[in-house]
Interface confidence: medium
């Protein structure tokens, strides 16, 4: 997260760290007791590594009573996700067992009504991604509030040049932005999950390259079919 600040500890009980061989790889969001939603591109290079999900964490390294690392039983990428596009960049991870819920571990309601979030709406994005252009990784969860950007502006030739489909949304990126390592994490508007940080190699913090988020409402049928 660029231009953000340390989050209040355990105030986002839905927040997940998707880990590869014991190290943070991507963000994720607990959407059901046994399911975490993230970005499909996150695991493309996971190769033969061990993928796990950390729940109930604020610090990645310090012991915390609510922290627990879960093995992944099943990884389900969206059937249309492809390595070379940002479209359909969603992944559902089934935990090896139902998460132990509590004040610091709780699923987040996700948007089912397929309607765009109003431009200008302030939404919260959180993650353990890099906090500066030198690539410094934080140990504790960071967050930032970002205004939603209208699709027409986001699709300008100077911005994302028509790449933003109706299944994607944008948020402003003027010095405050999601960045590498935040992919798969939640964009939360009014206490509801609206978007998932896409995992392309976009430049961060440049106002002409807004943050791109996959709209979960557009994928409600797929999410329901996997969770069923």
């Amino acid at each position: 997260i660029l231009g953000g600040r340390e989050a209040e500890a355990h105030a986002r009980p839905y927040m997940a760290s998707v880990q590869l061989n014991g190290a943070h790889l991507c963000g994720g969001v607990l959407v059901a007791e046994q399911w975490v939603l993230s970005a499909a591109h996150c695991l493309e290079d996971a190769a033969d590594g061990k993928v796990q999900v950390l729940l109930g964490a604020h610090s990645l390294s310090q012991p915390e009573p609510s922290k627990r690392l879960y093995d992944v039983l099943r990884a389900v990428p969206h059937p249309d996700s492809q390595p070379d596009t940002i479209d359909h960049d969603l992944l559902l991870l089934q935990l090896s067992e139902k998460a132990t819920l509590g004040p610091a571990v709780r699923p987040l309601p996700w948007q089912r009504v397929d309607r765009d979030v109003a431009p200008g709406t302030l939404c919260d994005v959180a993650g353990w991604g890099i906090v500066n252009h030198a690539g410094r990784r934080p140990d504790s969860l960071q967050h930032v509030l970002l205004p939603v950007l209208d699709r027409a502006t986001c699709n300008r030739r100077t911005h994302h040049d028509g790449a933003i489909t109706e299944r994607l949304m944008c948020a402003e990126s003027n010095r405050r932005d999601s960045c590498k390592g935040d992919s798969g994490g939640p964009l939360v508007c009014g206490g509801v999950l609206e978007g998932v940080v896409t995992s392309g190699s976009r430049v961060c913090g440049n106002r002409k390259k807004p943050g791109i988020y996959t709209r979960v409402a557009s994928y409600a049928a797929w999410i329901d079919s996997v969770l069923a």
Epitope: N21, L43, E44, D45, A46, A47, D48, G49, K50, V51, L73, R74, A75, V76, P77, P79, Q94
Partner: antibody
Framework: EVQLVESGGGLVQPKGSLKLSCAAS????????MNWVRQAPGKGLEWVAR??????????YYADSVKDRFTIFRDDSESMLYLQMNNLKTEDTAMYYC???????????WGTGTTVTVSS | DVLMTQNPLSLPVSLGDQASISCRSS???????????LEWYLQKPGQSPNLLIY???NRFSGVPDRFSGSGSGTDFTLKISRVEAEDLGVYYC?????????FGSGTKLEIK
């Protein structure tokens, strides 16, 4: 550019031995499981062997037809995959492909193959 | 071992036609983790095979959307909605759910 280049094929007599090599480049070889897949002349594809990464203890798996005769192993420091083939039979005659094993999918990158001919 | 049976062995088509290839496994290829590791590969003449479809219906990178996979349990299908000249070659199904992994015998797609 992600690349796999096989070598070591050739003509060998029945009951003989041969070691195939595969040089990998353009990706983090040590994190990937790797496979050998073969194809007899004019025939279909046959999976031969798989080796996992260090984080999975270099676990190996084999097709029944080559078990106890073939050994798959790797050298991560050199980004090399090997197949040691002993007690070769005429039915081992084939093109041998070195293949990378992805996370969501199995065989995403293939080499161009090396030909093994077992004949007296 | 899981036997993968492909039909037909040869499929003559006209360019622009739809083509359909069937693959049947001798037992369920649902992995213990719930995934179905059923894939389709195309081997063009003189080339190494290329991955087309993974996990039954996911198209791999760069694969045109005229290719689609379907099925579950033991019965699977690859469909090509409008065959183009570059689609000619041998198609193989593959199961990666149970060791030893096995390929189907192949289906040769050729021009009528």
């Amino acid at each position: 550019e992600v690349q796999l280049v096989e070598s070591g094929g050739g003509l060998v007599q029945p009951k003989g031995s041969l070691k195939l090599s595969c040089a990998a480049s353009g990706f983090s070889f040590n994190t990937y499981a790797m496979n050998w897949v073969r194809q007899a002349p004019g025939k279909g594809l046959e999976w031969v062997a798989r080796i996992r990464s260090k984080s999975n203890n270099y676990a190996t798996y084999y097709a029944d037809s080559v078990k106890d005769r073939f050994t798959i192993f790797r050298d991560d420091s050199e980004s090399m995959l090997y197949l040691q083939m002993n007690n070769l039979k005429t039915e081992d005659t084939a093109m041998y492909y070195c293949v990378r094993h992805g996370y969501y999918w199995y065989f995403d990158v293939w080499g161009t193959g090396t030909t093994v001919t077992v004949s007296s | 071992d899981v036997l993968m049976t492909q039909n037909p062995l040869s499929l003559p088509v006209s360019l622009g036609d739809q083509a359909s290839i069937s693959c049947r496994s001798s037992q369920s290829i649902v992995h213990s983790n719930g995934n179905t590791y059923l894939e389709w590969y195309l081997q063009k003449p003189g080339q190494s095979p290329n991955l087309l479809i993974y996990n039954v219906f996911n198209r791999f990178s760069g694969v045109p959307d005229r290719f689609s996979g379907s099925g579950s349990g033991t019965d699977f299908t690859l469909k090509i909605s409008r065959v183009e000249a570059e689609d000619l070659g041998v198609y193989y199904c593959f199961q990666g759910s149970h060791v030893p992994y096995t390929f189907g015998s192949g289906t040769k797609l050729e021009i009528k």
